[in-house]
Each structure stands twice: as C-alpha cells, then as structure tokens.
Interface confidence: low
C-alpha cells in the first residue's frame, strides 16, 4: 500500500465561527483522521478515516472561542489495523504520519461575515442606520449567540456614506449596531458597512456590505 502521504497546505476556513479545516492532497489507498486539542488539551478524533480533504470542526471550536486550538491531520493506511482510543490513534503501535495545523484562536481568527444594513429610520433631519446583528454558531444555554453577544464592545462597524449625488465620502466608526447622521431633507444617502474587531492585529475587518441608498430603501418599503 506504500507509505501514506503527509497532508499539506493545512488551512482554517472560518466565518462567524463556522470553521472548517482544509488540506491537500486527495488520498490514495489511505484515509485521514483529524485530531483537535479540546479545552482540556486532550486530543479528540474528528472526521475519522475520511477520504475528504476537509473537516468541519465548528462543534469543537465554539465550546470556547477564546481558546487557542491545535489540530493535526493524520494519514492512515487503509489496510492497516487501526484503533482509536479517544485521544490517540495507533497503527501497529506507531502513530501515523501527521501534519500540524497552525494554531486557531476563534475569537482572533474567524473571519467576519458580510454585514447587512437592516433598516433606516428617519426622524426629521436625523437618519438612523441599523446593521443586522447576525447569528453565529456559538451557543449558550442552547441558544445561538449573535456577533454582538460574542464580541461585545470589541465589535465595531465602519460606516462609509455619501450623498447620492456626491463622490465625496465620509467614514465613521461605531461600537454599536446603530449609527445616526444629520441629513438634508429630500436628499438620498448611500451607505456601505464593514464590521471590525477592535482588538485584532490582523484579519480585523469583514468584507463590505452591499451599498444601500435611502431612495432604494423607500422603494423597498413601497413608499
């Protein structure tokens, strides 16, 4: 059967805590098993004896999003006698070839999903913009938490806006999901939002939302 090839290009793909570990190559005559260190630093087998080159580890990493998880991908010959005892995988008394993934700290490393502008509320010359607080896959007491519930005041939004007829843009940062500006009556304003995590040194910002203009909003509402 030959010696199994070690996995390479181990990459974490994670958005709003939905987290998948991907790697290469496609296996031939062997399978992969992923191990992840849990909150107690035990190795736990996931995606046991799979021929896939990805493994969904969301259920593990959402248990504590402030923990730095370690993971490894083991290459296991198909025809060997294998036994897994929960935290170890042994082939004829030897650990199979494996490759370590980079450490993954969900709070720091998960990408922020594209935010959605939920609504505009106008009160005279004040325009209030509300950004939808999207759900994550992090649970507490059986309920999925929102981004705001997970990140608290560490979550902010960069709101870029312009008058509909203007090319000049203004940018503001808020640490809530709402933002107010003074507007001129009868003028359309267009908004673009990015989520950000203040404490991060890299991977700080989300992709931008779709640009939404107040005139479009009125037509959405049938006004």
């Amino acid at each position: 059967a030959g010696i199994p090839e070690k996995a390479f290009n181990l990459t974490w793909i994670s958005t709003d805590f939905k987290t998948i570990l991907e790697w290469q190559p496609k296996p031939t005559n062997y399978t992969y098993t992923v191990q992840i260190s849990d909150r107690s630093r035990n190795w736990k087998n996931k995606c046991f004896s799979t021929t896939d080159t990805e493994c969904d580890l969301t259920d593990e990493i959402v248990k504590d999003v402030t923990w730095a998880y370690e993971a490894k991908v083991l290459s296991v010959p198909r025809r060997n006698s294998v036994h897994g005892d929960g935290d170890q995988l042994v082939i004829h008394g030897e650990e199979p070839p494996f490759t370590n993934a980079p450490k993954f700290l969900p709070y720091r490393d998960t990408n922020l999903g594209q935010p959605v502008i939920q609504q505009f509320e106008q009160d005279g010359r004040k325009l209030n913009v509300v950004v939808k607080d999207s759900l994550t896959l992090v649970r507490k007491n059986g309920t999925f938490l929102t981004l705001r519930q997970v990140f608290g005041k560490d979550l902010g939004y960069i709101i870029t806006y312009r008058k509909g007829s203007s090319t000049g843009k203004k940018t503001n940062i808020t640490n809530t999901n709402e933002f107010s500006i003074d507007v001129e009556e009868g003028v359309s304003y267009c908004f673009f939002v990015q989520a950000m995590i203040f404490s991060r040194k890299t991977n700080q910002n989300s992709p931008g939302s779709s640009t939404v203009c107040t005139e479009q909003w009125k037509s959405f509402l049938g006004e």
Epitope: S40, W67, P102, K103
Partner: antibody, heavy 118, light 104 residues
Framework: QVQLKESGPALVKPTQTLTLTCTFS??????????VGWIRQPPGKALEWLAL???????RYSTSLKTRLTISKDTSKNQVVLTMTNMDPVDTATYYC??????????WGQGTLVTVSS | DIELTQPPSVSVAPGQTARISCSGD??????AYWYQQKPGQAPVLVIY?????GIPERFSGSNSGNTATLTISGTQAEDEADYYC?????????FGGGTKLTVL
Amino acid sequence: QVQLKESGPALVKPTQTLTLTCTFSGLSLSTSGVGVGWIRQPPGKALEWLALIYSNDDKRYSTSLKTRLTISKDTSKNQVVLTMTNMDPVDTATYYCARYKQETIDYWGQGTLVTVSS
Amino acid sequence: DIELTQPPSVSVAPGQTARISCSGDNLGEKYAYWYQQKPGQAPVLVIYDDNNRGIPERFSGSNSGNTATLTISGTQAEDEADYYCQSYDIEITVFGGGTKLTVL
C-alpha cells in the same frame, strides 16, 4: 497569591539523575488550561525551556532534551516533579518552575541552583 | 522548531525610548511574550499576547511579520535588566537569547 518554590539537591554528580520538586500554592492544577513548567538558566546565559505539564496531565518536553526528562504532578500535594537523567556539568544552572496560563508564563518561582560536579 | 533571535545588547539614555527586537519565522502569526530579569532574580512577565502589559505603562509591545518588538518609553535606570522574548511552536515553548538593556 500564587507562589511556587523549587526544591532539590544543590549538587549532583555527573551521570546521576536530578529530581526537582515544585511546590505551589494559590493555584489549582485542576483548572483547565493551567499548567506548571520548568525553565533553566546556566550562569550568565539565556533561559531554556525544559518541560510542561497541564491540568489534564498533558505533558510537553523540550525537543532536544525529551529523552532525559520526565515531568509528573501530584495534585493532592500541590507538587510537580521534574527528573532529568544522565546529568552533565553543562546542566549546571538555576532551575525555575513557573505557572502557565495557556502559553503565558505569569508566575515564576525564585529558582534553585543545581551544580553538576564530581 | 521556531528559533527566536534577539540582539545581545541595547543601550539607551535615560528618558529616551528603547526598542528590543525579537525575530522568528512568521512570528506575527503567533503571540509573543516578554520577560524582564534583573540580576539574581527570577524573570517577571512584562508583555503578554503581543501587547498586553504585565507591568508599568511605559512598556508596550507589537508583533507582525517576522518581528516582535518591546518598546520602553521614557526609559528609567530601574529598567536596566535582561529582556527575553518567548513564543511557542506546536507543543513547545521557545525563548529568545535575551537582550541586555543598558541605561547610560
């Protein structure tokens, strides 16, 4: 108040086995993510990491010294023990035990000087 | 295993800013920690998780690319000490070789 104190022989002979004990208070080795590690420092030289044991008995060792090191814990006595076999004069150093919180070494013992000489 | 490289010595005049570097492959992808050690004493944590302070405000840290940097603003005579950076690789802890900070 977290406190750690190292104890063991001040002098060992070459080829002998060194046994060091770290006795700690103010920390629980049954808390997830907490560990106790050993670091040494030869006179006038840099810090060198040796070994680490976490609350769940997960053990980690220096790549270059792992064949000579054994770390264990006795939670009931609030102690962590390090043994190092086949001691050599180059192992003369101050040996520190320290408290880990994930990767952060936030509390250190005062250190104990071990001299290896015949 | 990752290797961390520090300059053996750095000198600074009192009141000036001292910067001590620590380099290692892709160090910015990991967290860096800094310890201060005075003669005859155990090390003391000064910076953890790149830029969180363990002791006085004049100490700060940064970490990106291949280099972590400890910055001491308004250096005082009492800051004269050896400084060690630390990071980790899979399942191991790694220290730099240490930098002796001399306050002139």
